[in-house]
């Protein structure tokens, strides 16, 4: 058993039926030693009397707000939350698996440059009784700091019988090196509580390997005299980290047409600008990505030929 | 949300067996642990036995320990109650209940319930 925070307990149980549980001793916080009574939650069923109180945590039935009280008093209380393992397994009952980049993939997380600044998400079906805290370090070992806000729903979408919910969280490491190569990975780490159910999810990353860039902006079209060739121009996005120069990234322009069939053009560049020739109800689009590092491609940003 | 619906009760003699269905509407079923509930008359709710979202799991009350048997079929929404050996205190009418906490024999760790289906065991 450990404190997660004050006055909440989490019981770590190796479930299995008829496993015999966890023996877990609670102490009431009183300077007081006699006429204690325990109750659990609502009920006014007295388990025990005297300053602690033994209990055999089996299942969920057995966690919740245990309180002690002296003559109509309560003197203090003790949430007793349970962290299961079943198969030598941590349950993940709370978080979806995002399956990308591959299976038990619960947290996924995402730079637009280089500053230190991260945004990670997760997804669950569950709407109600939820809580989430997030911690998070360069290393493990010799941890540097990393400071997160609080997890928000961030979106929430229906997938066919199933609403799912996606929380996020923004985090900035406190002393960002930009240029600098990255030794040590960052961790994440979530704890969720879900009514009397305690699971934790980590992830860890390079900043480098989670780059997405925002999609170019300012994307215009000249087109060229006397030909059906047009200038396809754009700028970097605004939050894509400076000097440009050192930060570079490639682009990928792309003319498709009206149909998703049609044959796609596409031209690689690492200027901001390229010729393509446009055709009757094509659009143009282009995107980023770290010109020396194969991080991910940024969004798409378009423009219709006409 | 979930609607539940049992069904599969009646009137049976001691020593013979009885299949109980529960079956669900409204949310993805396959995201809820699910248990057997019962209440005689007089009595309190009394926990029979769970099945965790997948199907790998389930856990029973000491009285019922080999002689029921909880599965579900998460493709049709259902969850089944096979009960054998049937004794006269088996009597009760018979819940199905779903929640998020498995393994759980508390009724209020449950926030979805059916109607209920009367099983009588007679002597």
């Known amino acids: 058993i450990w404190e997660l925070k004050k006055d909440v307990y989490v019981v770590e149980l190796d479930w299995y039926p008829d496993a015999p549980g966890e023996m877990v001793v609670l102490t009431c916080d009183t300077p007081e030693e006699d006429g204690i009574t325990w109750t659990l939650d609502q009920s006014s069923e007295v388990l025990g009397s005297g300053k602690t109180l033994t209990i055999q945590v089996k299942e969920f039935g057995d966690a919740g707000q245990y309180t002690c009280h002296k003559g109509g008093e309560v003197l203090s209380h003790s949430l007793l939350l349970l962290h299961k393992k079943e198969d030598g397994i941590w349950s993940t009952d709370i978080l979806k698996d995002q399956k990308e980049p591959k299976n038990k993939t619960f947290l996924r997380c995402e730079a637009k440059n280089y500053s230190g600044r991260f945004t990670c998400w997760w997804l669950t079906t569950i709407s109600t009784d939820l809580t989430f805290s997030v911690k998070s370090s360069r290393g493990s070992s010799d941890p540097q700091g990393v400071t997160c806000g609080a997890a928000t729903l961030s979106a929430e979408r229906v997938r066919g019988d199933n609403k799912e919910y996606e929380y996020s969280v923004e985090c900035q490491e406190d002393s960002a090196c930009p240029a600098a190569e990255e030794s040590l990975p960052i961790e994440v780490m979530v704890d969720a509580v879900h009514k009397l159910k305690y699971e934790n999810y980590t992830s860890s990353f390079f900043i480098r390997d989670i780059i997405k860039p925002d999609p170019p902006k300012n994307l215009q079209l000249k087109p060229l005299k006397n030909s059906r060739q047009v200038e396809v121009s754009w700028e970097y996005p605004d939050t894509w980290s400076t000097p440009h120069s050192y930060f570079s990234l490639t682009f990928c322009v792309q003319v498709q047409g009206k149909s998703k069939r049609e044959k796609k053009d596409r031209v690689f560049t690492d200027k901001t600008s390229a010729t393509v020739i446009c055709r009757k109800n094509a659009s143009i689009s282009v995107r980023a990505q770290d010109r020396y590092y194969s991080s991910s491609w940024s969004e798409w940003a378009s423009v219709p030929c006409s | 949300e979930v609607q539940l619906v049992e069904s599969g009760g009646g009137v049976v003699q001691a020593g013979e067996t009885l299949r109980l269905s529960c079956a669900a509407s409204?949310?993805?079923?396959?995201?809820?642990?699910m248990g057997w509930f019962r209440q005689a008359p007089g009595t309190e709710r009394e926990f029979v036995g769970t099945?965790?979202?997948?199907?790998?799991?389930?856990y029973y009350t000491d009285s019922v320990k080999g002689r029921f048997s909880i599965s579900r079929d998460n493709a049709k929404n259902t969850m089944y109650l096979q009960m054998s050996s049937l004794k006269p205190e088996d009597t009760a009418v018979y819940y199905c209940?779903?929640?998020?906490?498995?393994?759980?024999?508390?009724?209020?760790?449950?926030?979805?319930w059916g109607q209920g289906t009367q099983v009588t065991v007679s002597s």
């Open positions: 209940a779903a929640g998020w906490l498995f393994p759980s024999s508390r009724s209020r760790d449950y926030d979805y």
């Open positions: 409204g949310r993805s079923f396959s995201n809820y642990e």
């Open positions: 099945i965790n979202r997948r199907g790998s799991s389930t």
